[in-house]
């Protein structure tokens, strides 16, 4: 049952998805949204906030293999602590070994999500794209 | 409303997307879900068919503008009627002006889908990943 | 495969004139027909297309403005392009082209021979 | 219309030489570039299509690049059979347009 499913298989069910604001898109019962204004790291969380969201946070490969087909580059909710030199996530959560391949493109303490579970490192007061997740229970 | 929201607003209401097949993407009632293995453009449209699907057809910019950011190639269900010279889908539908650039790369007469609005013609023998759809009531 | 042209020469201003270019050895029915023109000592300039099968579809260039006009004969695997209130403007080369392939209508590697049109009084 | 604006309208060059010959369009095409060569007194030849692709049967010293406005014609030693006028075409859209054209011409 992955997004990429490797043999053709007639869905045992027919599901709803959500609940998820108006016009995201909804996905294993987790809501996305990529907004094109760009935005710093720090304005992008606020407005993920205000729409009671969080900048994306990737937990898992399986549950979130849509990432996969992201193209360009967008913020997620992933910062570098410089007194550990953990990544975490905006939950206070450190980033699991194996789930993103982080590249150091810049020096910064923020992350930009790309395509194939990437996080490519930058400057947080850059301007980006973004994406908001929330969540549901 | 749009995938990619200009301005920052609170959604005014949380709401369910579908009917779906289990784990398929939901996206203003659209179902959409890309399978990674490759089949040639026949054997595509039968995979869709066979989960009550069909290949994708894209109709609007507007409520699909989740396609914008979408990575790679993969076959839609757009095929080319060599008799009349025209691009129609799957249901008889002939293509509309303006929604995708046609873009002459292959000698074929089938499409794929490539990301912001991009049809790539393609000889229809070729194996390509796929996206298929279900169009929600 | 070869585009074969006809019916150029010398025209009064004001005139009208029918250049005519066959297909052969290829499927006439289920590929486009482009129109473009030189003039002497000018770059290309496109004129419009039409399929040669049953839709007879057509695109124009945004300056003909109806005094040109494209027709086919399925039966011929003719492309026909009417010039009308020929001005010295349009003296040219007229090419006619065709698609690579039957599904494209933008990308031309089948050329006719051209054809001279001259508008003088 | 898009207008497509090609540089230089016209070079000077020896045999052996790199040539390259650039083409802008006037908003983002997604590589649906041509490039033609003519002799005079002949019609236009097909040379590269969708931006890179050789067309069959053309010397492999051609090459096409670019991506959005802006693609680049080169050819790696410039050879006595290549002097003529190369045109770049736009074939994202109708209407089809042409560049001015670029003469290349012996040194």
């Known amino acids: 049952n992955s997004l990429f499913n490797q043999e053709v298989q007639i869905p045992l069910t027919e599901s709803y998805c959500g609940p998820c604001p108006k016009n995201w898109i909804c996905y294993k019962n987790n809501c996305y949204q990529f907004f094109n204004e760009s935005k710093n790291w720090y304005e992008s969380q606020a407005s993920c906030m205000s729409q009671n969201a969080s900048l994306l946070k990737v937990y898992s490969k399986e549950d979130q293999d849509l990432l996969k087909l992201v193209k360009s580059y967008h913020w997620m909710g992933l910062v570098h602590i410089p007194t550990n030199g953990s990544w975490q996530w905006e939950d206070g959560s450190i980033l699991s070994p194996n789930l993103l391949t982080i590249i150091e493109m810049q020096k910064g303490d923020c992350a930009l999500y790309a395509s194939s579970f990437k996080g490519y490192i930058e400057n947080c007061s850059i301007p980006n794209t973004y994406i908001c997740m929330q969540r549901t229970v | 409303n749009s995938l990619f929201n200009q301005e920052v607003q609170i959604p005014l209401t949380e709401s369910y997307c579908g009917p779906c097949p289990k784990n398929w993407i939901c996206y203003k009632n659209n179902c959409y879900q890309f399978f990674n293995e490759s089949k040639n453009w026949y054997e595509s449209q039968a995979s869709c068919m066979s989960q009550n699907a069909s290949l994708l057809k894209v109709y609007s910019k507007e409520d699909q503008d989740l396609l914008k950011l979408v990575k790679s190639y993969h076959w839609m269900g757009l095929v080319h009627i060599p008799t009349n010279g025209s691009w129609q889908w799957e249901d008889g539908s002939i293509l509309s002006p303006n929604l995708l650039t046609i873009i002459e790369m292959q000698k074929g007469d089938c499409a794929l889908y490539a990301s912001s609005f991009k049809g790539y013609i393609e000889n229809c023998s070729i194996p390509n990943t796929y996206i298929c759809m279900q169009r929600t009531v | 495969q070869q585009l074969e042209q006809s019916g150029g020469g010398l025209v009064t201003p004001g005139g009208s004139l029918k250049l005519c270019c066959i297909g052969?050895?290829?499927?006439?029915?289920?590929?486009?027909m482009t129109w473009v023109r030189q003039a002497p000592g000018k770059g290309l300039e496109w004129i419009g297309c039409?399929?040669?099968?049953?839709?007879?579809?057509?695109y124009y260039a945004s300056w003909v403005n109806g005094r040109f006009t494209l027709s086919r004969d399925i039966d011929q695997s003719t492309g026909c392009l009417q010039v009308n209130s020929l001005t010295a403007a349009d003296t040219a080369m007229y090419y006619c082209a065709r698609p690579g392939y039957r599904s494209w209508s933008k990308t031309f590697d089948l050329w006719g021979q051209g054809t001279m049109v001259t508008v003088s009084s | 219309d898009i207008q497509m604006t090609q540089s230089p309208s016209s070079l000077s060059a020896s045999v052996g030489d790199r040539v390259t010959i650039t083409c802008r369009a006037s908003q983002d095409i997604s590589e649906s570039l041509n490039w033609y060569q003519q002799k005079p007194g002949k019609a236009p030849k097909l040379l590269i299509y969708?931006?890179?692709s050789l067309q069959s049967g053309v010397p492999s010293r051609f090459s096409g690049s670019g991506s959005g406005t802006d693609y680049t014609l080169t050819i790696s030693s410039l050879q006595p059979e290549d002097f003529a006028t190369y045109y770049c075409?736009?074939?994202?859209?109708?209407?089809?347009?042409f560049g001015g054209g670029t003469k290349v011409e012996i040194k």
């Open positions: 075409q736009q074939a994202n859209s109708f209407p089809l347009t």
């Open positions: 969708a931006a890179s």
């Open positions: 052969s050895g290829f499927d006439f029915n289920t590929y486009w």
């Open positions: 039409i399929h040669g099968g049953s839709s007879g579809s057509t």
